[in-house]
């Protein structure tokens, strides 16, 4: 039979196809960002500089369940998802189409997690198994942070995974966490 949905008074943000969360569109060779995909605004010139305050780094609240194998949290947890562009995309021609959203020769600003918080959750398991306790790391705030050429690629990978659009109609895969991170993943079903 599987799990029954847990009923509670938590607010649930429900993603609909092609809506929330919406990662930046992929860039194809010899194309600038499609206006329709960019909220109707024309794309910025690649080397245009603007004050960071002119760009939006939004904190979207999503309610998710934590899972660990067949076990799932009794209550959902609310996490922030950092969304928005902090500055013009700085692209080099050889980076186009590969989801690289930085220009190595100049600084870049990203809307990325700023602070995290730890939350203890109780996981309920099927088959009368005893509940498990897990501690999960959740995003607590977002910030426009400056990246430079000195940030190595592994660091950029953490900031840049949003740049790859999930296959249409398919569930976006949760980002792989480091070995130190929690085994309990946040289920992408808000």
């Amino acid at each position: 039979q599987g799990w029954q949905a847990f009923k509670n008074d938590a607010t649930e943000i429900i993603p609909e196809l092609g809506e929330y969360p919406e990662p930046p569109p992929e860039l194809e060779n010899n194309k600038t960002m499609n206006r329709a995909e960019n909220g109707g605004r024309p794309p910025h010139h690649p080397f245009e500089t603007k004050d960071v305050s002119e760009y939006s780094c939004r904190e979207l609240h999503f309610t998710r369940y934590v899972t660990d194998g067949p076990c799932r949290s009794a209550k959902p947890v609310t996490e922030l998802v950092c969304s928005g562009q902090c500055g013009p995309a700085r692209l080099l021609p050889n980076a186009i189409g590969r989801g690289k959203w930085w220009r190595p020769s100049g600084p870049d600003f990203r809307c990325i997690p700023d602070r995290y918080r730890a939350q203890r959750v109780q996981l309920l398991c099927p088959g009368g198994e005893a509940p498990r306790a897990r501690k999960v790391r959740l995003v607590a705030s977002c910030k426009c942070k400056r990246l430079t050429r000195f940030h190595n690629q592994s660091e950029l990978k953490d900031f840049g995974t949003e740049a790859a659009r999930p296959q249409k109609g398919r569930k976006p895969r949760p980002r792989a966490r480091s070995a130190k991170a929690n085994q309990a993943e946040l289920e992408n079903a808000y």
């Epitope: 799990w3 847990f6 008074d9 607010t11 649930e12 609909e16 569930k171 079903a189």
Partner: antibody
Framework: CQSVEESGGRLVTPGTPLTLTCTVS????????MGWVRQAPGKGLEYIGI?????NTYYPTWAKGRFTISKTPTTVDLRITSPTTEDTATYFC?????WGPGTLVTVSS | DVVMTQTPASVEAAVGGTVTIKCQAS??????LKWYQQKPGQRPKRLIY???TLTSGVPSRFKGSGSGTDFTLTISDLECGDAATYYC??????????????FGGGTEVVVK
């Protein structure tokens, strides 16, 4: 390729329960929410309710008790528990920009 | 439950003109708002989501703005094909005690 299609609309007498089915293809219902919307002839759109990826259902106050939404991995059902003539409408299921063509329900004695 | 109030109910404008449709939510819905266009006998077509993000393929003549409780859809350089009924729809967070989904009453746009 994604598609959404409703079925089950027909002429029913008042008080006879009716279940409409929304069949989807290429859409992961364990992740995306699917809503039901209706439109009476010559009237505006009316939101009936939505079922989330994890199976939670949400209805506006006017629809609670009158409708029940449930799902399987590839279908989403809308049950009209006790139809009245006011429930005569075209019923759509939708997620994001994907809407079915609608199915017509006529309630008449 | 959130209630969406849309104004005006009907508006007439000439080809090449501009139309502004307003939508007000009974409570703050952040930017969880969509705009739809519906022509007679057709299913609704989403124009805008997240209050201001244009659906791919929709002309940039359609512009959505606003957040919180007040939202606007502006259609500029009106074309004959823009004649339709336009609806706003909230898709804010829902809980067992409150549904964040509702449509506005619709605005009929007549193009002269």
């Amino acid at each position: 390729c994604q598609s959404v299609e409703e079925s089950g609309g027909r002429l029913v007498t008042p008080g006879t329960p009716l279940t409409l089915t929304c069949t989807v293809s290429g859409i992961d219902l364990s992740y995306y929410g699917m809503g039901w919307v209706r439109q009476a002839p010559g009237k505006g759109l009316e939101y009936i309710g939505i079922i989330s990826g994890i199976g939670n259902t949400y209805y506006p106050t006017w629809a609670k008790g009158r409708f029940t939404i449930s799902k399987t991995p590839t279908t989403v059902d809308l049950r009209i528990t006790s139809p009245t003539t006011e429930d005569t409408a075209t019923y759509f299921c939708a997620t994001g920009d994907f809407w079915g063509p609608g199915t017509l329900v006529t309630v008449s004695s | 439950d959130v209630v969406m109030t849309q104004t005006p109910a009907s508006v007439e404008a000439a080809v090449g003109g501009t139309v502004t449709i307003k939508c007000q939510a009974s409570q703050s819905i952040s930017t969880y708002l969509k705009w739809y266009q519906q022509k007679p006998g057709q299913r609704p077509k989403r124009l805008i989501y997240s209050a201001s993000t244009l659906t791919s393929g929709v002309p940039s003549r359609f512009k959505g703005s606003g957040s919180g409780t007040d939202f606007t859809l502006t259609i500029s350089d009106l074309e004959c094909g823009d004649a339709a009924t336009y609806y706003c729809q909230s898709n804010a967070g829902s809980s067992s005690s409150s549904c964040g989904y509702a449509f506005g009453g619709g605005t009929e746009v007549v193009v002269k």
